[in-house]
Amino acid sequence: EVEKTACPSGKKAREIDESLIFYKKWELEACVDAALLATQMDRVNAIPFTYEQLDVLKHKLDELYPQGYPESVIQHLGYLFLKMSPEDIRKWNVTSLETLKALLEVNKGHEMSPQVATLIDRFVKGRGQLDKDTLDTLTAFYPGYLCSLSPEELSSVPPSSIWAVRPQDLDTCDPRQLDVLYPKARLAFQNMNGSEYFVKIQSFLGGAPTEDLKALSQQNVSMDLATFMKLRTDAVLPLTVAEVQKLLGPHVEGLKAEERHRPVRDWILRQRQDDLDTLGLGLQGGIPNGYLVLDLSMQEALS
């Protein structure tokens, strides 16, 4: 806390300018009017105030707006935003995408801080859903943003927003998240033709069910092994050797290198060795000839 002292004669600030950087903390407290500061916040960023001086400026704004800053002030906080705590930010009502962008810019190139996470949370809750423009902005600043959301939060993403998602935005998503995103992507891209559709849907396929993989296998998509390895194991297991061969096209040769890893390993165990041999890749571990395969899951469903 800065002691309350009278402003020395001739030092009362008429505007926020460079002369203030030579003021001591107590002079800033005494000589800068909080309302003047609020109306000229845009100037603060251009003035190289010290860390301690910024404490005083924040204190003045906190006193002026105990219930939370108005958006007109928030939009021009600039690097003073880095002084805010999550508790401060929870008092704000940020509705403008321009305000959000201005504050994210200050944190650009750094991982998401608790302040930024709180800001985004307030903004998205205020909007009611993650619309395309917001998602565009957030993934531009934080490529991993989408994968930081819970499946419940992702359910509020409208299919139209999926167009803003780039493959790298999904790199850290787990299967539960892709389970939510895949149906939205399928809906968003449904009017595209085969090859274009596959390019767009490819990053989301970790959430695809068996029937969709079977359908893709009929479209000469030539899925690469990296994508195949990210598919849900339970979706891959029912695929036949012929379907996997069609799905992967020329990439089918890559199965050999992945035969010890999921989902390839588990898929091999479900195939007849005879069928695997038709691939000519030397894949081993299939069901030997003459063995009967009982689908116990089907038996349980019937009883």
Epitope: T50, L82, K108, G109, H110
Partner: nanobody, 118 residues
């Protein structure tokens, strides 16, 4: 690890000149501003001169027209040219830099002593 190392201080006669240097190392972020502070014996540390990333300079009233701050962006070095020195200029001079992107942080050097004898 950011390090600021000052040099160029010493004993000088009133009316004389000195040039302080501050070599900055370990900087992996855009610097918002560099500055020089002076701490006279028994007093608080006061800002003397500051230069922003764009090259804008500002000076305390007591040194205007006598001191000049400059920076060499290639070598990450900041200078303070001090002319017409008086006994009032005696003190420890600290180099300082501001980080304002990603985090708010001020970095300081260890200081260099300047003594002006009359």
């Amino acid at each position: 690890q950011v390090q600021l190392v000052e040099s160029g201080g010493g004993l000088v006669q009133a009316g004389g000149s000195l040039r302080l240097s501050c070599a900055a190392s370990g900087i992996t972020f855009p610097v918002n501003a560099y500055g020089w502070y002076r701490q006279a014996p028994g007093k608080q540390r006061d800002l003397v001169a500051i230069i922003s990333a764009g090259g804008t300079t500002n000076y305390a009233d007591s040194v205007k027209g006598r001191f000049a701050i400059s920076k060499d962006n290639v070598n990450n070095t900041v200078y303070l040219q001090m002319n017409s020195l008086t006994s009032e200029d005696t003190g420890v001079y600290y180099c300082y830099l501001q980080r304002r992107i990603g985090m708010l942080r001020d970095y300081w050097g260890q200081g260099t002593q300047v003594t002006v004898s009359s």
